[in-house]
Amino acid sequence: LIIGFGISGKHFITVTTFTSAGNIGEDGTLSCTFEPDIKLNGIVIQWLKEGIKGLVHEFKEGKDDLSQQHEMFRGRTAVFADQVVVGNASLRLKNVQLTDAGTYTCYIRTSKGKGNANLEYKTGAFSMPEINVDYNASSESLRCEAPRWFPQPTVAWASQVDQGANFSEVSNTSFELNSENVTMKVVSVLYNVTINNTYSCMIENDIAKATGDIKVTDSEVKRRSQLQLLNSG
């Protein structure tokens, strides 16, 4: 969470940003809020990126002004224009690229004053894991798959019954490059599993941490997955 203050004459406004992460190939949002101003025509929003000449995006008098927009962002940006008067200056970014990572500045000017705040935007790939029982294996095993990760993550297994156990000797993890030659598919197999136990497959890089849980009993298989972005907020 970054809060910036700006001074314009005697007036300053608070601008707040949140460190956020973009999933490459998908749409992303760079969060920025400011003190609301009921006069839309008096609000100017500028997004800038460190090391880039020109603007990422500019919104003023209720409309986008893309005359100074850098070409790498052409056709890829928007604000939530409906929500600007209530203080939402967040930037929407289409088809996030690795090269979109960096330090951004959200600059706001309203009839109340002006202010800005920086935001660190990380880019990578992250996806939910899915765990299935691998009946083809000679012994009962679990297969944890997640389709898109970058940078290469670490994978660890845990179990409810054998808490603290090291499963690296009884698991095998592989990373397969996807067709776009950036992201990778993660596959990890855990061998010699026992029924009536809950196993967790944890995949983590510096952007996100994902966990898939599976509980196998004689009568049913229960699954649960969750994904958490790291260092956000």
Partner: antibody, heavy 115, light 107 residues
Framework: QVQLVQSGAEVKKPGASVKVSCKAS????????MHWVRQAPGQRLEWMGY????????SYNQKFKGRVTITVDTSSSTAYMELSSLRSEDTAVYYC????????WGQGTLVTVSS | DIQMTQSPSSLSASVGDRVTITCKAS??????LSWYQQKPGKAPKTLIY???SLADGVPSRFSGSGSGTDFTLTISSLQPEDFATYYC?????????FGGGTKVEIK
């Protein structure tokens, strides 16, 4: 200036579908949600749903129980509203509209459902 | 669904009068309320959104106030072109719902 221009009046038979278009100009199409509202003769306005042109996301009034589909073509800055399984009570003027930002609505498209 | 109760349903006023129209939501909608003007045979026009923000190109004699459940549209000095029907809309919760309208007529 900002303009929303809708397609012309339609006469349809019960059970048919109608697709109304709304061409936007004068602003960046992907910045504002596009809403669809209808007004039956002598009735209050009724919200049907909206589309987020940035990503095609939609929200619908469940009253229409899957009969309404709102889409966009960003290359032509056009929004579409399709209403299927038409009945006589769907006879109304259909509008594309902004809830925030700009005053303008589309001029309206009269859809008459009659056997 | 959230019910929007608009009052009065009609009123008579003279040019130059200050006119107030109210809208009451059946539950808290924060500031998610818009006001619209419609003239006979014409498309509605957005006047106010988020309870207090004036839409682009709308004269400053129109203003909105309120939050939560009670909202007001005020026309500070009624002009001949303001005789029309006015609607409120809550956009805090789907489905968005309109009030029944207030017809402003010439006295």
């Amino acid at each position: 200036q900002v303009q929303l221009v809708q397609s012309g009046a339609e006469v349809k038979k019960p059970g048919a579908s109608v697709k109304v278009s709304c061409k936007a100009s004068g602003y960046t199409f992907t910045s504002y949600y596009m809403h669809w509202v209808r007004q039956a003769p002598g009735q209050r306005l009724e919200w049907m749903g909206y589309v987020d042109p940035f990503n095609g996301g939609t929200s619908y009034n469940q009253k229409f129980k899957g009969r309404v589909t709102i889409t966009v073509d960003t290359s032509s800055s056009t929004a579409y509203m399709e209403l299927s399984s038409l009945r006589s009570e769907d006879t109304a003027v259909y509008y594309c509209a902004f809830i925030a930002g700009f005053a303008n609505w589309g001029q309206g498209t009269l859809v008459t459902v009659s056997s | 669904d959230i019910q929007m109760t608009q009052s009065p349903s009609s009123l008579s006023a003279s040019v130059g009068d200050r006119v107030t129209i109210t809208c009451k939501a059946s539950q808290d909608i924060k500031s998610y309320l818009s006001w619209y003007q419609q003239k006979p045979g014409k498309a509605p026009k957005t006047l106010i959104y988020y309870a207090t923000s004036l839409a682009d190109g709308v004269p400053s004699r129109f203003s909105g106030s309120g939050s939560g459940t009670d909202f007001t549209l005020t026309i500070s000095s009624l002009q001949p072109e303001d005789f029309a029907t006015y609607y409120c809309l809550q956009h805090g919760e789907s489905p968005y719902t309109f009030g029944g309208g207030t017809k402003v007529e010439i006295k």
